[in-house]
Amino acid sequence: LQDPCSNCPAGTFCDNNRNQICSPCPPNSFSSAGGQRTCDICRQCKGVFRTRKECSSTSNAECDCTPGFHCLGAGCSMCEQDCKQGQELTKKGCKDCCFGTFNDQKRGICRPWTNCSLDGKSVLVNGTKERDVVCGPSPADLSPGASSVTPPAPAREPGHSPQ
C-alpha cells in the first residue's frame, strides 16, 4: 500500500493528528520536499546576519552578512569581521601586513609579494601593504635604448566565490 503521506507536496506536511491529510506549513516554517511529516522552522537572520532571501512555505530563508562582515561556511553559517586592505585578521584582530607581504582583499591573510626574479623579470612597480609588486620585462630588455614600458592598468580585485 502506498503511504498516503507521499502525496503531500512541498509546502505542506502530513498531519497525523488529522487523519494524515496534507496541511499547509504553519507561519515561519517550510518543507522543501514532499512527503514530510513535519515542517522545519525557518532560519532567522539576526544580529550581524541579514536576510538575503525570505523564507517561503517551500524554502528556507537565506542569510548573508551586514556590511563590515563576510560569510563563512555552507549557507553563510557564520559572519567574520572584515579588515582593511593591507591587513589580515588574526585571532587578536586586524593587523597590518608585514613588509614583503600584501593583502588586496578585506579578508584572508597577507600574501608574499611576487619574486619577479624567479621568472627572470625585473620589478617595475614596488609592492605595498595593499598591492603586489608589478613585474616588468627581463633585466636584459632594460638595456640603454630599449623602449620604455607602460605600467599595466591596476589589477581588478579578485572575486569571492560563494562558500
Partner: antibody, heavy 120, light 108 residues
Framework: QVQLVQSGAEVKKPGASVKVSCKAS????????MHWVRQAPGQGLEWMGW????????NYAQKFQGRVTMTRDTSISTAYMELSRLRSDDTAVYYC?????????????WGQGTLVTVSS | YVLTQPPSVSVAPGETARITCGGD??????VHWYQKKPDQAPVLVVY???YRPSGIPERISGSNSGNTATLTLSRVEAGDEADYYC????????????FGGGTQLIIL
C-alpha cells in the same frame, strides 16, 4: 559550474621538460589565483606554487625554484605549469586547484589531475 | 613550517574518527582539510579551521587551538575511507603552502 580540465598523461625521459595545461570554465579566470599541487606514488600532497592569472605574478615553493615556470593565457582561460630537467622522482600526478578569491582559505576546486611519468 | 599527522587512524563504522595535525602554534593559523581517494582529485572538506563547504555533511567538523588541529568525522561510513591532509598558508615567501603528510582513515 566551475570546472578545471587538465591535459592528458605524459611520459618523459629524464632531463626533458613537461608542460601541463589547466583550462578553467564557469567563472572569471583572471579573478582567482591558480595553484599547482602534485602527488608522487605512495607520497602525500606537495604544494608547488601559484600564479595570479590577472597579472601573471607567481610564487614557487623553494624546492622547485629554477625548474618550474607557471604561465597563463587569459584569452583561452588556461594556466600552464612547466617543469624542466625532469628526474624519476618527478613522476607524479599534477593537479591545478583554484583559490577561492582570497589568500588563506582552502583550495575549493581541483582539476582531475595529470599523470607525468619520467622514465628512461 | 612542518605539519605532523599520524600515518593512519582506524575506526569501526558508526564510531567517531579524530585525525590530528600538529604544528608549532598552529592555533594561530587557519587550517584546511582535504579528503583524497585513490584516482580522484582532493576534495576540500573543512576550511579555515571549522567551516564546511557546501555539500560536505555536518558530521564532518574541525577545530584548532594551541599546537593541534583536529578533523572529526562522526558516525563514520565505509565511504569515508580515504587519506586526509591538513594544510596551511604562510606569509613566508620561501614556502607559502604546506601540507601535512596525510592520514589514512581505515574503516574496520
Amino acid at each position: 559550474q566551475v570546472q578545471l580540465v587538465q591535459s592528458g598523461a605524459e611520459v618523459k625521459k629524464p632531463g626533458a621538460s613537461v608542460k601541463v595545461s589547466c583550462k578553467a570554465s564557469g567563472y572569471s579566470f583572471t579573478g582567482y589565483y591558480m595553484h599547482w599541487v602534485r602527488q608522487a606514488p605512495g607520497q602525500g600532497l606537495e604544494w608547488m606554487g601559484w600564479i595570479n592569472p590577472n597579472s601573471g605574478g607567481t610564487n614557487y615553493a623553494q624546492k622547485f625554484q629554477g625548474r618550474v615556470t607557471m604561465t597563463r593565457d587569459t584569452s583561452i582561460s588556461t594556466a600552464y605549469m612547466e617543469l624542466s630537467r625532469l628526474r624519476s622522482d618527478d613522476t607524479a600526478v599534477y593537479y591545478c586547484a583554484r583559490e577561492p578569491g582570497y589568500y588563506g582559505s582552502g583550495l575549493d576546486y581541483w582539476g582531475q589531475g595529470t599523470l607525468v611519468t619520467v622514465s628512461s | 613550517y612542518v605539519l605532523t599527522q599520524p600515518p593512519s587512524v582506524s575506526v569501526a563504522p558508526g564510531e567517531t574518527a579524530r585525525i590530528t595535525c600538529g604544528g608549532d602554534d598552529i592555533g594561530d593559523k587557519r587550517v584546511h582539510w582535504y579528503q583524497k581517494k585513490p584516482d580522484q582529485a582532493p576534495v576540500l572538506v573543512v576550511y579555515e579551521d571549522r567551516y564546511r563547504p557546501s555539500g560536505i555533511p555536518e558530521r564532518i567538523s574541525g577545530s584548532n587551538s594551541g599546537n593541534t588541529a583536529t578533523l572529526t568525522l562522526s558516525r563514520v561510513e565505509a565511504g569515508d575511507e580515504a587519506d586526509y591532509y591538513c594544510q596551511v598558508w604562510n606569509s613566508s615567501s620561501d614556502h607559502p603552502g604546506v601540507f601535512g603528510g596525510g592520514t589514512q582513515l581505515i574503516i574496520l
